[in-house]
């Protein structure tokens, strides 16, 4: 249930995709992956107000618990709903080689 | 990849399974669902301090570039990795049904 | 614009050693790693190996290796393969490509080809 | 090693005729595949990569699609200077792997 779509608190201040460039270095890769020397990470970024991107049943009791008891049930939080492989050349014991990660770039975000 | 189970904040104070009890009209049910009359909502609640439960490379990625940019990217989320199922008795157009709901209760936390 | 060029075409006879050259330009050599890929007459690509233009790490095609040996000069960002005993069947255009900015392991662009006949 | 396996090898087409092209993996490879066309003489140059995504510069007449072990290069509308050859190539392990090609000629 991907309930609303529309930010009530303005344009790109809600949950969504986020480009951020980051050098093996910035992720504590550069030890191991040789290629690429960067990475454009999407990651998903923004606030989760009432029923926005709900993933589930329980983002939606998360968001009702939280309009009641703010101090003990944090928000819906905003996370990848979905990813798109990567594929990195790395160093291996053995040598160089093609590796695909299926977790490592976010395709799409929700709240939950 | 769930590393560190190990919470550097302090006993209780990482990303863990927490038990919220809520009447149907704290959860703004009470007009459809006839029982149970009290859920206890099992929820993820807590800090992602570094590593801590990083579901995986993508949390690993946002631990990295959190603690480059702080005010970009935020730390991983304390989200649900699965969930119980649970069945309610509600009111339907044609009467009273049983319905099972697999992503109502968390049944498990991870960072992401 | 990025472009990979070439050194010009050799006869060898079998037995000797070629070492083509990559010239690159237009992006920051040591960012993308550059591969060889050879064609002989009438046939289709051959891979010949990988070099990480950064760390210098490589790969080889298996049935290649120990005749092959792929290097880079940072300083004139030029990539170099070396072909050592030389037979009839490695008469070919050699290629060198770099890895592709959107995929690592697809490739683009590429040079312009070295023809090298191996002939006595 | 991964084997591709690319059919038909050749295919007689009209100007504006809809070409496709498939391209078989012997064990998956996510969508890691890469298309290439190469006119006589020339070196190849990058139509697709990643499966489906359209190189920078390329006519959107060309599409690819597929994951796992199958995948398909299209021309929607063949032009003339589209005859030419086209190979797969597949990028999720080395030794990076070429399909045989397929020659597009004018019928």
């Known amino acids: 249930a991907r309930n609303g779509d529309h930010c009530p608190l303005g344009p790109g201040r809600c949950c969504r995709l986020h480009t951020v460039r980051a050098s093996l270095e910035d992720l504590g890769w550069a030890d191991w992956v040789l290629s690429p020397r960067e990475v454009q990470v999407t990651m998903c970024i923004g606030a989760c107000p009432s029923q926005f991107r709900a993933a589930n049943m329980h983002a939606q009791i998360k968001t009702s618990l939280h309009r009641l008891k703010p101090d003990t049930v944090p928000a819906p939080c905003c996370v990848p709903a979905s990813y798109n492989p990567m594929v990195l050349i790395q160093k291996t014991d053995t040598g160089v080689s093609l590796q695909t990660y299926d977790d490592l770039l976010a395709k799409d975000c929700h709240c939950i | 990849a769930r590393n560190g189970d190990h919470c550097p904040l302090g006993p209780g104070r990482c990303c863990r399974l927490h038990t919220v009890r809520a009447s149907l009209e704290d959860l703004g049910w009470a007009d459809w669902v006839l029982s149970p009359r009290e859920v206890q909502v099992t929820m993820c609640i807590g800090a992602c301090p570094s590593q801590f439960r990083a579901a995986n490379m993508h949390a690993q990625i946002k631990t990295s570039l959190h603690r480059l940019k702080p005010d970009t990217v935020p730390a991983p989320c304390c989200v649900p990795a699965s969930y119980n199922p649970m069945v309610l008795i509600q009111k339907t157009d044609t009467g009273v049904s049983l319905q099972t709901y697999d992503d109502l209760l968390a049944k498990d936390c991870h960072c992401i | 614009q990025v472009q990979l060029v070439q050194s010009g075409a050799e006869v060898k006879k079998p037995g000797a050693t070629v070492k083509v050259s990559c010239k690159a330009s237009?992006?920051?050599?040591?960012?993308?790693?550059m591969s060889w890929v050879r064609q002989a007459p009438g046939q289709g690509l051959e891979w010949m190996g990988y070099?990480?233009?950064?760390?210098?790490?490589?790969v080889y095609a298996q049935k290649l290796q120990g005749r092959v040996t792929m290097t880079t000069d940072t300083s004139t960002s030029t990539a170099y393969m070396e072909l050592r005993s030389l037979r009839s069947d490695d008469t070919a255009v050699y290629y060198c490509?770099?890895?592709?900015?959107?995929?690592?392991?697809?490739?683009?662009?590429w040079g312009q080809g070295t023809l090298v006949t191996v002939s006595s | 090693d991964i084997q591709m396996t690319q059919s038909p090898s050749s295919v007689s087409a009209s100007v504006g005729d809809r070409v496709t092209i498939t391209c078989r993996a012997s064990q998956g490879i996510s969508r890691w595949l890469a298309w290439y066309q190469q006119k006589p003489g020339k070196a190849p140059k990058l139509l697709i990569y990643a499966a489906s995504s359209l190189q920078s510069g390329v006519p959107s007449r060309f599409s690819g699609s597929g994951s796992g072990t199958d995948f398909t290069l299209t021309i929607s509308s063949l032009q003339p200077e589209d005859f030419a050859t086209y190979y797969c190539q597949q990028g999720a392990s080395f030794p990076l792997t070429f399909g045989g090609g397929t020659k597009v000629e004018i019928k």
């Open positions: 237009g992006y920051t050599f040591d960012s993308l790693g």
């Open positions: 070099i990480s233009t950064y760390s210098g790490d490589t």
């Open positions: 490509a770099r890895e592709s900015g959107q995929q690592v392991s697809a490739l683009d662009p």
